[in-house]
Interface confidence: low
Amino acid sequence: KAMHVAQPAVVLASSRGIASFVCEYASPGKATEVRVTVLRQADSQVTEVCAATYMTGNELTFLDDSICTGTSSGNQVNLTIQGLRAMDTGLYICKVELMYPPPYYLGIGNGTQIYVIDPEPCPDSD
Amino acid sequence: KAMHVAQPAVVLASSRGIASFVCEYASPGKATEVRVTVLRQADSQVTEVCAATYMTGNELTFLDDSICTGTSSGNQVNLTIQGLRAMDTGLYICKVELMYPPPYYLGIGNGTQIYVIDPEPCPDSD
């Protein structure tokens, strides 16, 4: 079943390569188990950036080597992606699945365009 | 008379606060004197950033204290805006006027969203 997911149109990564945005879903029911997946679309290729399943009211747990971290609050997921470089600029799509209890719901946002600018190297200290 | 002006939708300023974009106009005739104005729209306020009048085939000359520089080639103007900070993020609109010979033509682009990220300060050198 389809579900509406909202996310900001544009976000700028910080000069440290960190971008944060909120992914909000219109929950049709009281889900206790939610999975959030971040997909990156660039040059018509879609790749998965990270994914986490969480019990509502608990923290999101991404894999240890994930570039994502996040927190949840009600129907909002606050996502942070780290280690971004200019080449990572692209459309980051938030996919939300209400896994439990049934029925299963799927929602896909329109994407957040994340812009990343590589910093200038600092001059060597003498 | 109205004239079509094209400019990119989005440009990222470099970490040094420099943003460049091309403003192209569909000249209905052979203008010898062209005026280019860059306007910034943010929070529904429109302010003038810089302006230059040039003879086709010659360099654009902005005022000495201007944050803009530029070159022209045919119906294209290559604009560079310097000294940008994160607070300068906004929509930069290219306005082109064909001043001479008559008839006068005016064209306004849809704007280029320039995103600016302030760099992290470099660590103090000991």
Partner: antibody
């Protein structure tokens, strides 16, 4: 101990319907999902759908949507799977299976299974 | 739908052999994978979940590994009771599909 006991074998005509039951015991029926899986003779396993007995919420495999109906009776701790408009390719063993306790977020597993119900569709 | 491709479809082995069965998903399933053993006329039995966690009462000769799209079930020393058909299943997004099965036969 946990048990899932299914109804007996059925022989059905093409175009008819069959309703298979699965009686659960040894655990709290409403604490676990009930999934349905089928296996055609000599073939692999195919997931049909899942019902949450507590809420009645259902997720179907799109392949079976419109033909399969999952229900659950909390008072008797029994789950049902009805399949309509039967055709010969629906001949299979139909299993009910409980989804394991959600001890971890990854624990999407079917830990206990019924003995299976053979449904034969033949004219 | 996510396709689960199991290989080999069948294999012959002897008691004591090390047996490896692989399962490849058509997309990343993030360890949301279970392995089952099925003997003729019986219901499947859970062996492994979370790609590598053994089910209750499953002998330690069984192990699961893998990540992303590629997963493996290993039987370190095949026993007579291990001759059966093995299935993988993902739980990443519905429908939760199974692999085609691997039949382990006596050589």
């Amino acid at each position: 101990q946990v048990q899932l006991v299914q109804s007996g074998a059925e022989v059905k005509k093409p175009g008819s319907s069959v309703k298979v039951s699965c009686k659960a015991s040894g655990y709290t029926f409403t604490d676990y999902e009930m999934h349905w899986v089928r296996q055609a003779p000599g073939q692999g396993l195919e997931w049909i759908g899942v019902i949450d007995p507590e809420t009645g919420g259902i997720t179907y495999n799109q392949k079976f949507k419109g033909r399969a109906t999952l229900t659950a009776d909390k008072s008797t701790s029994t789950a049902y799977m009805e399949l309509s408009s039967l055709r010969s390719e629906d001949t299979a063993v139909y299993y009910c299976t409980r989804r394991g306790a959600r001890a971890t977020v990854y624990n999407y597993v079917m830990d206990y299974w019924g003995q299976g119900t053979l449904v034969t569709v033949s004219s | 739908d996510i396709q689960m491709t199991q290989s080999p479809s069948s294999l012959s082995a002897s008691v004591g052999d090390r047996v490896t069965i692989t399962c490849r998903a058509s997309e990343n399933i993030h360890n949301y994978l279970a392995w089952y053993q099925q003997k003729p006329g019986k219901a499947p039995k859970l062996l492994v979940y979370n790609a590598k966690t053994l089910g209750d009462g499953v002998p330690s000769r069984f192990s699961g590994s893998g990540s992303g799209t590629d997963y493996t079930l290993t039987i370190s020393s095949l026993q007579p009771e291990d001759f059966a058909t093995y299935y993988c299943q993902h739980f990443w997004s519905t429908p939760w599909t199974f692999g085609g099965g691997t039949k382990v036969e006596i050589k």
